[in-house]
């Protein structure tokens, strides 16, 4: 049994986390700041130990090596990863049958489709939310997550990957979406803009966030991350919206602290291990949901995202630092890595809570024009 | 094969100290984090500290800080105790672990006894 | 520090299943691992993450995980498995590795 992370009431636009209704000032995105259709972030990032096909990382799970202990991880991604292997860190998926998806950028070539198919597929992400339009559904219950909270050792791998920064998380952080739909989390990387310019890759009724996480996570009905690509609920991605708030965040900057270290592309370091879940919001109930894809090539559709309503509050020195310290392909700086909103085309996107009634500052008159698709969840 | 041999341990007054050697073997000894853990006569296990793999992170329980200080030789694939201002209630078998995947220890050392008594 | 509790002593006759509990506060959101000791030995990892099976450990010990409480269960007993049985988590308020008391199995 799973014990749901404790809900703990917090008022609405309170808690430590950040608000609880991430909207604010109308800033549509421009031109320039969202980076062109083929450039999604470093998203779905999955863990790897050189850029792998895709998802900048994908996992592989493999058996553990003799080597690494006599552990039994037939399910889990493992790592035999230079450095600190300390144990099965989700391991990089390295077939290189997609080779030229580990050659993409953000706003350039080659268009993404081109990089792979998928990329031009009709069930894209990110979106932009618009709660009005969201359907309530009152079977999305609160998260739950169950060994989140790690010890510092085993450390970590913080690797700049050219597209992000990402922390291959270690087996056992296991999150449900509801009976039935368990995961196990992969990674968490980041996305983010440059100095004056917001970087988040959902967006919610065109605002754009100064920054998003994504905690990836792999279907515990699937062994490895290319078994899952491309099937429903495969992969699941939880993100969350980052904003700029009075006092410096103590949970990120575990490991903003050690961006300096990996400022260099490919380059990567040992972090303690810390409480995963402190870097996401405190209220697990209220979220918005919607099938997508991963935001970087290979742009796997499938993917149930899981976007949180509350956000998470960091220092601005803390943003200055995630945005301007890391460098990326050409010697240029790794900014701006995250991918224009792709059209809904037809899709619904669910919330946990009645998010049309009274949950934005734009909410003129309570609208529900969808209805719950998912009522016997 | 894994294997992790203690030595060290011995007899000693309090308020005196004692260095306890881990020797490691049959795996990459830097790419592990490194704990003691600790089991007075007929009691329970007690973790006592830990240590990252490339030695720069290291950590310790309430009851030996400021006194137990852990440290490692890469080098020598060898984990050290240095313990100062023993007391009684130091009196255990002291064991070291290999970090395990999400937070345990796997495998253990067979243990080295140390005795504090005057 | 938070503490973790166990029940000082287990007995089951030889065949039949021994359930060792380990309580704690919100232990369901923890990793608990459970190690084996048996006398003049040193421990070992027989349960980790509430309950996967390294290598080497007989199918006959399963762990599950409730909201306070985490068990460790020991199918067919043999008298093999006589020993000291101890649960350990990491506590993230006290930021410390934490043991149970321990449990002794006794096959009567």
């Known amino acids: 049994q799973r014990l749901p992370r404790m809900q703990e009431d917090s008022p609405l636009g309170g808690g430590s986390s950040g608000e609880d209704d991430p909207l604010g000032e109308e800033d549509l995105p421009s031109e320039e700041d969202s980076p062109r259709e083929e450039d999604p972030p470093g998203e779905e990032d999955l863990p790897g130990e050189e850029d792998l096909p895709g998802e900048e990382d994908l996992p592989e799970v493999k058996p553990k090596s003799e080597e690494e202990g006599s552990l039994k991880l037939e399910d889990l991604p493992t790592v035999e990863a230079p450095g600190d292997p300390q144990e099965p860190q989700n391991n990089a998926h390295r077939d290189k049958e997609g080779d030229d998806q580990s050659h993409w950028r953000y706003g350039g070539d080659p268009p993404w489709p081109r990089v792979s198919p998928a990329c031009a597929g009709r069930f894209q992400s990110p979106v932009d939310i618009r709660p009005q339009l969201a359907a309530f559904c009152p079977a999305l219950r609160p998260l739950e997550l169950l060994g989140f909270q790690l010890p510092p050792l085993p450390e970590l791998r913080l690797r700049n990957n050219g597209h992000s920064v990402q922390l291959t998380l270690p087996p056992g952080l296991e999150m449900a979406l509801g009976p039935g739909r368990e995961y196990r989390a992969l990674q968490l990387h980041l996305h983010w803009g440059a100095a004056g310019r917001p970087g988040s890759e959902h967006t919610v009724e065109g605002h754009r966030f100064p920054a998003e996480i994504h905690v990836v996570h792999l279907s515990t009905a699937f062994a490895r991350v290319d078994e899952a690509l491309g099937r429903p609920g495969g992969l699941a991605v939880l993100a969350a919206f980052l904003e700029e708030g009075p006092e410096e965040n103590s949970a990120y900057e575990q490991l903003l602290s050690r961006l300096e270290e990996i400022a260099e592309e490919g380059s990567e370091t040992q972090v303690p291990g810390l409480d995963i879940s402190a870097l996401l919001p405190s209220d697990f109930s209220r979220y918005f949901q919607y099938e997508g894809s991963l935001t970087t090539p290979p742009c796997a559709q499938g993917v149930i995202w899981t976007v949180f309503n509350q956000t998470v509050m960091l220092s601005a020195k803390q943003l200055h630092t995630l945005s301007d310290t890391l460098w990326g392909p050409g010697d240029s700086r790794l900014q701006l890595n995250f991918r224009a909103t792709q059209p809904l085309n037809g899709r619904v996107i669910e919330a946990s809570f009645p998010a049309g009634v009274d949950s934005s500052p734009r909410a003129a008159e309570p609208v529900q024009l969808n209805s719950c698709l998912a009522a016997g969840d | 094969e894994v294997q992790l041999v203690e030595s060290g341990g011995g007899v000693v007054q309090p308020g005196r100290s004692l260095r306890l050697s881990c020797a490691a073997s049959?795996?990459?000894?830097?790419?592990?984090?490194m704990h003691w853990v600790r089991q007075a006569p007929g009691k329970g296990l007690e973790w006592v500290s830990a240590?990252?793999?490339?030695?720069?992170?290291?950590y310790y329980a309430d009851s030996v800080k400021g006194r137990f200080t852990i440290s490692r030789d890469n080098a020598k694939n060898t984990l050290y105790l240095q313990m100062n201002s023993l007391r009684a209630e130091d009196t255990a078998v002291y064991y070291c672990?290999?970090?395990?995947?999400?937070?345990?220890?796997?495998?253990w050392g067979q243990g080295t006894l140390v005795t504090v008594s005057s | 520090q938070p503490g973790l509790t166990q029940p000082p002593s287990v007995s089951v006759a030889p065949g039949q299943t021994a359930r060792i509990t380990c309580g704690g506060d919100n232990i369901g959101r923890k990793s608990v691992h459970w190690y084996q000791q048996r006398p003049g030995q040193a421990p070992i990892l027989v349960i980790r993450d509430d309950r996967d099976r390294p290598s080497g450990i007989p199918e006959r010990f399963s762990g599950s995980s409730s909201v306070n409480t985490a068990t460790l269960i020991i199918s067919r007993v043999e008298a093999g498995d006589e020993a000291d049985y101890y649960c350990?988590?990491?506590?993230?308020?006290?930021?410390?590795?934490?043991f149970g008391p321990g449990t002794k199995v006794t096959a009567l």
């Open positions: 672990a290999r970090a395990a995947v999400t937070g345990g220890f796997d495998p």
């Open positions: 240590i990252s793999g490339s030695g720069g992170s290291t």
């Open positions: 049959g795996f990459t000894f830097s790419s592990y984090g």
């Open positions: 350990q988590v990491w506590d993230s308020s006290s930021k410390h590795y934490v």
